[in-house]
C-alpha cells in the first residue's frame, strides 16, 4: 500500500483506567496530514465516535478506560500529500496496581516508570498524562510507597511533584494520581513511578539536544495564528523539564491573564536509545509586541529561541 | 541481599493456635509484599497470601481466609501469620517469600517452619 | 483459578540426558508470570526461571524455559547429578498465585 512502516517500542500500561496515544511523528504529522487508527492490522478503523470505549479523537486513540483484552499492536497511518507513514505501537496491559496487590503487577519495568532524583540538590518528578484536549485533568495527588506524600519538603507544582533537598530516603515507589473528565464520565489515572538516587549531577555528559527550533526569525503575518514546536531529544531515564519561556519567565505565567500565548501539553515518541519530546507553543492572535521577543524553548541545561519577524513588504502587490 | 529468619519449629495441640513470624533483614521490608506458603509433607506447595506493610493490605487464597491472619510489625521488620483452630491437616512447612516492585515471583525464600500439630 | 498441570509427576535420567517437563495452565496466562522454582530434599525452593525464559541468578545455562498462553516448559540441556528435585511451575497473574502439583526428577 505504499506506506512506510515505523516500528515503535513497548507501552505497558494499566488496566481499568484511561490511556491514550497520540500518533505524532514529526516532521510528518506538521503539516497537512490525515491520520486513521488501526488495531492488530484490522482494516476497520478505530472508531471515531466519543462514547465508543476505545476511540480516535483527533489523531489520537483514547481508551476508556484500558481493558486487559486491549493488549496488542496498533497502527496509526498518516497520510499526507505525498507520503504514508505506518506507526506501530504494542501496547501491553497489566491488571493490578501494586499497592493493591502483587499479584498480576508490573510484568517488568519500562524506562517510562523510572525516574532520577540527584542527592542533595532540589530535583523533581513528572507525571506523564498524556491526554488529548477533550479530556480535562483535575489536581495532581502524589504517593510514594502507597502513601500519599506530606511534608514541606514536597510541592506539586502542575504535572511535577518539587523535591527539596533530595536525600537517600526519598528512593522508592512513587504513584501520581488525577482524576481525569471525559464526556461526563469521571475516570481515575494512576501512574507508577521507580525513582533512584544519583549522586551524579548529569547523565554521563549527555545534554538533552533541541533539534527545532534553532535560534531563528520566523516571518508571521500580524493577526494570525501561529503554533510553533519544540522537538527535544533526550535520554530516556531524564528528569529534564521542557517548556517555552518569555523574558524568563514560563509563558503560561507571562500572559496568565489574557491566556493568548500558551504552552502546549507535552507529548514523547520513545525510541529505542531515547525518546523524541514535543511541546508547543500558541500564539492565539500575534500582537505587535510579540516581534522582536526572544521566545525560549527550555531543556534542561539545553535552550533555542525563535523571534517573530513582520514579513517583508511584497512590492509586487502595488 | 535479603536474609528472611524463621523458627525452625512449633509444636502445638490440635484446635490451639500459633503465630508464625518471618524476620526481614534491609530496609526494603515495607515496600515489598511478603508472601506465606504451604507445604505439607511430601506434598506440593500452596499459597496463603499476601500482606503489604505500609499500608497493612492482605490478600488471602479463599482456601485459608478462615484459617491464616497476616499481620506485620513495621518497626522490627517482621511479618507474622496466625494459624487458628489447628488441626493435623495444618501439620506442614510454612515459608514466607517477599515480591518485589517489578519482580513478581519469588526470588527468595525462609527457611520455613515446620509446625506439627500433635496431642 | 488457574490449575497448572505439570507432567511427567516423576521421572529418572541418566546423566548427560536432555529433560523436559511441561506445565499446561487452565487458562491463558502472559509468560511475564510463569515461573519455575526447584527444590531439593529439606531445603526451600529456589527460583530457576523467572517469566518463562528468563535464568535467575546463580542459575546454570543448561537450563531454559519457553512457552506462552497455556504450554510452557522447562529443559534442562544435559542432566547433571546435581539437578535431582523436585521442579514446580508457578503463576502469578491472578489471585490466587498456584503451583503446578511438582516433577520430582531421579537418577536413572
Known amino acids: 500500500d505504499g506506506c512506510k512502516d515505523i516500528f515503535m517500542k513497548n507501552e505497558i500500561l494499566s488496566a481499568s483506567q484511561p490511556f491514550a496515544f497520540n500518533c505524532t511523528f514529526p516532521p510528518i504529522t506538521s503539516g497537512e496530514v490525515s491520520v486513521t487508527w488501526y488495531k492488530n492490522s484490522s482494516k476497520i478503523p478505530v472508531s471515531k465516535i466519543i462514547q465508543s470505549r476505545i476511540h480516535q479523537d483527533e489523531t489520537w486513540i483514547l481508551f476508556l478506560p484500558m481493558e486487559w483484552g486491549d493488549s496488542g499492536v496498533y497502527q496509526c497511518v498518516i497520510k499526507g500529500r505525498d507520503s504514508c507513514h505506518r506507526i506501530h505501537v504494542n501496547l501491553t496491559v497489566f491488571e493490578k496496581h501494586w499497592c493493591d496487590t502483587s499479584i498480576g503487577g508490573l510484568p517488568n519495568l519500562s524506562d517510562e516508570y523510572k525516574q532520577i532524583l540527584h542527592l542533595g540538590k532540589d530535583d523533581s518528578l513528572t507525571c506523564h498524562l498524556h491526554f488529548p484536549k477533550s479530556c480535562v485533568l483535575g489536581p495532581i495527588k502524589w504517593y510514594k510507597d502507597c502513601n500519599e506524600i506530606k511534608g514541606e519538603r514536597f510541592t506539586v507544582l502542575e504535572t511535577r511533584l518539587l523535591v527539596s533537598n533530595v536525600s537517600a530516603e526519598d528512593r522508592g515507589n512513587y504513584a501520581c494520581q488525577a482524576i481525569l473528565t471525559h464526556s461526563g464520565k469521571q475516570y481515575e489515572v494512576l501512574n507508577g513511578i521507580t525513582v533512584s538516587i544519583t549522586e551524579r549531577a548529569g547523565y554521563g555528559g549527555s545534554v538533552p539536544k533541541i533539534i527545532y527550533p534553532k535560534n531563528h526569525s520566523i516571518e508571521v503575518q500580524l493577526g494570525t495564528t501561529l503554533i510553533v514546536d519544540c522537538n527535544v531529544t533526550d535520554t530516556k531515564d531524564n528528569t529534564n523539564l521542557r517548556c517555552w519561556r518569555v523574558n524568563n519567565t514560563l509563558v503560561d505565567d507571562y500572559y496568565d491573564e489574557s491566556k493568548r500565548i500558551r504552552e502546549g501539553v507535552e507529548t514523547h515518541v520513545s525510541f529505542r536509545e531515547h525518546n523524541l519530546y514535543t511541546v508547543n507553543i500558541t500564539f492565539l492572535e500575534v500582537k505587535m509586541e510579540d516581534y522582536g521577543l526572544p521566545f525560549m524553548c527550555h531543556a534542561g541545561v539545553s535552550t533555542a529561541y525563535i523571534i517573530l519577524q513582520l514579513p517583508a513588504p511584497d512590492f509586487r502587490a502595488y | 541481599q535479603v536474609q528472611l529468619q524463621q523458627p525452625g519449629a512449633e509444636l502445638v495441640k490440635p484446635g490451639a493456635s500459633v503465630k508464625l513470624s518471618c524476620k526481614a533483614s534491609g530496609d526494603t521490608f515495607t515496600n515489598q509484599w511478603m508472601h506465606w506458603v504451604k507445604q505439607r509433607p511430601g506434598q506440593g506447595l500452596e499459597w496463603i497470601g499476601e500482606?503489604?506493610?505500609?499500608?497493612?493490605?492482605?490478600n488471602y487464597n479463599e482456601n485459608f481466609k478462615s484459617k491464616a491472619t497476616l499481620t506485620v510489625d513495621k518497626s522490627s521488620s517482621a511479618a507474622y501469620m496466625q494459624l487458628s483452630s489447628l488441626t493435623s491437616e495444618d501439620s506442614a512447612v510454612y515459608y514466607c517469600?517477599?515480591?518485589?516492585?517489578?519482580?513478581?515471583?519469588?526470588?527468595?525464600w525462609g527457611q520455613g517452619t515446620l509446625v506439627t500439630v500433635s496431642d | 483459578e488457574i490449575v497448572l498441570t505439570q507432567s511427567p509427576t516423576t521421572m529418572a535420567a541418566s546423566p548427560g540426558e536432555k529433560i523436559t517437563i511441561t506445565c499446561s495452565a487452565s487458562s491463558s496466562i502472559s509468560s511475564n508470570y510463569l515461573h519455575w522454582y526447584q527444590q531439593k530434599p529439606g531445603f526451600s525452593p529456589k527460583l530457576l526461571i523467572y517469566?518463562?525464559?528468563n535464568l535467575a541468578s546463580g542459575v546454570p545455562a543448561r537450563f531454559s524455559g519457553s512457552g506462552s498462553g497455556t504450554s510452557y516448559s522447562l529443559t534442562i540441556g544435559t542432566m547433571e547429578a546435581e539437578d535431582v528435585a523436585t521442579y514446580y511451575c508457578q503463576q502469578g497473574s491472578s489471585i490466587p498465585v498456584t503451583f503446578g502439583a511438582g516433577t520430582n526428577l531421579e537418577l536413572k
Open positions: 500482606i503489604f506493610p505500609n499500608s497493612g493490605r492482605t
Open positions: 517469566r518463562t525464559s
Open positions: 517469600a517477599p515480591v518485589f516492585y517489578g519482580a513478581p515471583w519469588f526470588a527468595y
